[in-house]
């Protein structure tokens, strides 16, 4: 499956929007750094079937969408930027869903890569727990925003590697 050219443009736009969501200087938040245990192995160049990679990427974007569409994120972040971010993520999800259908068919896709998808879900659970423990403070959001930018960049790199293998 060929992801459209607009997909990589959407990725870049989403990253730019994340960067623009900064509300306070990150220099004041150094002590709030946290190890969210990003599931690096799910994004490494192991013997990844393309369908598995697409499923993991889809889960990553879906969980990002969920994280930023809570009432707490709306209260903490710029709503105009969030709305634009949702649009970009929604388009990403649509592109990847079309790809999943083409690669493996609708029936087996949710179950085949359960471990990888679960690893991504647990990663986002850790992020949500951190925000809760930090009472959704400005610094907590700043740390999470930096983490999502990093994980999003790694997702983009995986997509680039998939494209280069075609």
């Amino acid at each position: 499956c060929d992801l459209p050219q607009t997909h990589s443009l959407g990725n870049r736009r989403a990253l730019i929007l994340l960067a623009q969501m900064r509300r306070i200087s990150p220099f004041s938040c150094l002590k709030d750094r946290h190890d969210f245990e990003f599931p690096q192995e799910e994004f490494d160049d192991k013997q990844f079937q393309k369908a598995q990679a697409i499923s993991v990427l889809h889960e990553m974007i879906q969980q990002t969408f969920n994280l930023f569409s809570t009432k707490d994120s709306s209260a903490a972040l710029d709503e105009t930027l969030l709305d634009e971010f949702y649009i970009e993520l929604d388009q990403q999800l649509n592109d990847l869903e079309s790809c999943v259908m083409q690669e493996v068919g609708v029936i087996e896709s949710p179950l085949m890569y359960e471990d990888s998808i679960l690893a991504v879900r647990k990663y986002f659970q850790r992020i949500t727990l951190y925000l809760t423990e930090k009472k959704y403070s400005s610094c907590a959001w700043e740390v999470v925003r930096a983490e999502i930018m990093r994980s999003f960049s790694l997702s983009i790199n995986l997509q680039k590697r998939l494209k280069s293998k075609e």
Epitope: A19, R22, P26, F27, C29, L30, R33, V143, E147, M149
Partner: antibody
């Protein structure tokens, strides 16, 4: 391969201005902060300040605030350290190093080779 | 500012010795401590980050421990290339601060 390449050694007179550089390559320059560290002859390491090249936000050590200016040009992946009026006590080796920002990753994992600044009349 | 105090300032040891350097912070820094090695005329090199994580490519004879205010760098069996100056640095809050350094010399 990640690299930070600093500009060459400088010999200046007291009162002169100076701008030294640190060019990053092999990684996304705007995804990491760049810190500057001073080492006076025969002495230890002193953190001077740091910049986020994505938006040029800076933080300085109180010891260096107002004495130096840190800046960056993300279009050419380069950070700068500058003085408007050098003093003999600014004679030192200056290092740049990259910092992961708020991400849980190694601090100052890559360093420039250093720029030796000598200020003498 | 958070003060970092290293001890000893210098030590003499032989190849094969177990060497321990300590670093104390003036207030709790959780596990936000890094250790660097510097050889004459060279840039510092990161050895340990977040108190106990070994930086990629660093030999396993180097290890770090501690949290709060007291930290230790251990070299389990000193090698000829380990004679250098070692610095601790807190990454808990700005301004970032380094210890004064510990010079490891040949006995």
């Amino acid at each position: 391969e990640v690299q930070l390449v600093q500009s060459g050694a400088e010999v200046k007179k007291p009162g002169e201005s100076l701008k030294i550089s640190c060019k990053g390559s092999g990684y996304s320059f705007t995804s990491y902060w760049i810190g500057w560290v001073r080492q006076m002859p025969g002495k230890g390491l002193e953190w001077m300040g740091i910049i986020d090249p994505s938006d040029s936000d800076t933080a300085y050590s109180p010891s260096f605030q107002g004495q130096v200016t840190i800046s960056a040009d993300k279009s050419i992946s380069t950070a700068y350290l500058q003085w408007s009026s050098l003093k003999a006590s600014d004679t030192a080796m200056y290092y740049c190093a990259r910092h992961p920002g708020l991400n849980w990753a190694p601090d100052f994992d890559y360093w420039g080779q250093g720029t030796l600044v000598t200020v003498s009349s | 500012d958070i003060q970092m105090t290293q001890s000893p300032s210098s030590l003499s040891a032989s190849v094969g010795d177990r060497v321990t350097i300590t670093c104390r912070a003036s207030q709790s820094i959780d596990g936000s401590l890094n250790w660097y090695q510097q050889k004459p005329g060279k840039a510092p090199k990161l050895l340990i980050y977040f108190a106990s994580s070994l930086q990629s490519g660093v030999p396993s004879r180097f290890s770090g421990s501690g949290s709060g205010t007291d930290f230790t760098l251990t070299i389990s069996s000193l090698q000829p290339e380990d004679f250098a100056t070692y610095y601790c640095q807190q990454s808990y809050d700005f301004p970032l601060t380094f210890g004064q350094g510990t010079k490891v010399e040949i006995k």
